[in-house]
């Protein structure tokens, strides 16, 4: 019963993680313009994402532009896109596998097979979480590095956008969900080691407790 509850919790967290990843990857809020210094009336704020960039005027008007050429994009952006898409597909696969092996479903009858399926789902979700974490951490590292690099002009300095924070949260949820699914898997039954097939039985250890005097330090 407790394992069913853990399974449900794990899957719920994973679903939230998947939704968070979807929103994080889709929103153009990975990098936001950093206006450093005082006495500046900001005329516009630039938002940059994996698929588009937006310019928000002080009037509130927003103009977004989808990146044109795939080949002209920086390699790190292309890699981030790919990792996000793979993570989303992988997390979706993990959830489908988890549902298949869940205690509350009858897709698989064998309990042992169910446990293995749920364990597999947990591993897949953990992997998906790691895949989300890679582009998010990489981008955050690049932003921070540029922010403190004196050779990067102020016009090019950026701050961490909301998508990155959401990405971290989503990765945590996916990994937590995956971890819980891995935990629900019961440990394999430790079988009593069978002695050699001899014609006589091995005498039991001395002492009422079954412990030998050598077991005491």
């Amino acid at each position: 019963m407790a394992s069913t509850g853990l399974e449900l919790l794990g899957m719920t967290l994973a679903v939230l993680g998947w939704l968070g990843t979807l929103v994080s990857c889709a929103l153009p809020l990975w990098k936001v313009t950093a206006f450093i210094g005082n006495s500046i009336v900001v005329a516009q704020v630039v938002w940059e994402g994996l698929w588009m960039s937006c310019v928000v005027q002080s009037t509130g008007q927003m103009q977004c532009k989808v990146y044109d050429s795939l080949l002209a994009l920086p390699q790190d952006l292309q890699a981030a896109r790919a990792l996000c898409v793979i993570a989303l597909l992988l997390a979706l696969l993990g959830l489908l596998v988890a549902i298949t092996g869940a205690q509350c479903t009858t897709c698989v009858e064998d309990e042992g097979a169910k446990a293995r399926i749920v364990l597999t789902a947990g591993v897949i979700l953990l992997l998906a979480g790691i895949l989300v974490l890679i582009p998010v951490c990489w981008t955050a590292h690049a932003i921070i590095q540029d922010f403190y690099n004196p050779l990067v002009a102020e016009a090019l300095k950026r701050e961490l956008g909301a998508s990155l924070y959401l990405g971290w949260a989503a990765a945590a949820l996916l990994m937590l969900g995956g971890g819980l699914l891995c935990c629900t898997c019961p440990p394999p039954q430790v079988e009593r080691p069978r002695g050699p097939r001899l014609g006589y039985s091995i005498p039991s250890r001395s002492g009422a407790s079954g412990l030998d005097k050598r077991d005491y330090v």
Epitope: G37, I40, L151, E154
Partner: antibody
Framework: EVQLQQSGPELVKPGASVKISCKTS????????RHWVKQSRGKSLEWIGT????????RYNQKFKGKATLTVDKSSSTAYMELRSLTSEDSAVYYC?????????????WGQGTSITVSS | DIQMTQSSSSFSVSLGDRVTITCKAS??????LAWYQQKPGNAPRLLIS???SLEAGVPSGFSGSGSGKDYTLSITSLQTEDVATYYC?????????FGGGTKLELK
Amino acid sequence: EVQLQQSGPELVKPGASVKISCKTSGYTFTENIRHWVKQSRGKSLEWIGTINPNNGETRYNQKFKGKATLTVDKSSSTAYMELRSLTSEDSAVYYCTRGITKSPYGMDYWGQGTSITVSS
Amino acid sequence: DIQMTQSSSSFSVSLGDRVTITCKASEDIYNRLAWYQQKPGNAPRLLISGATSLEAGVPSGFSGSGSGKDYTLSITSLQTEDVATYYCQQYWSTPPTFGGGTKLELK
């Protein structure tokens, strides 16, 4: 007192290369980035490029890529600029400057300038 | 690249005059503007950074103002030692660019 001491004037032949130096004193060499600026006779100022003395990282004006190479020697607190394949267009006064600490692409201290004359 | 335009390349002035030199950027430079003074045979000298901040040792007769794309350098009362060429420079984006310069000449 912050000082940027540049090497003396140079008269070079077309096609040749020249390396000018900029020795700094009066502050920690690695704390500020170093810029190089060109001023042709009677003309305005043009930014050539910049170097971070901490790690040797450089940024160049597209116009001077392949023309100028910036380097530093931390042990002697000296910045260098090498200009290659010189033509009469490269005849100018070249300045090394120090980037403002909080706004590195502003320039608070300037060397006295090095005059380069390209002539056969 | 951001273009910096100093509308007057030269100015005929008299001692004691109030002088105003203007500089216009091709796009918003968010006050990332410096003013330099250059006398013949010398290197430029930084007068003002951040559009309005006077550097140490610069006479209080100099002042900077402006925001967005338009900036101004003012000299309240022109002295002999102020006769020079003045350059503006944006350091908002790379490459940093300079104005063409405004030369002050005595009448």
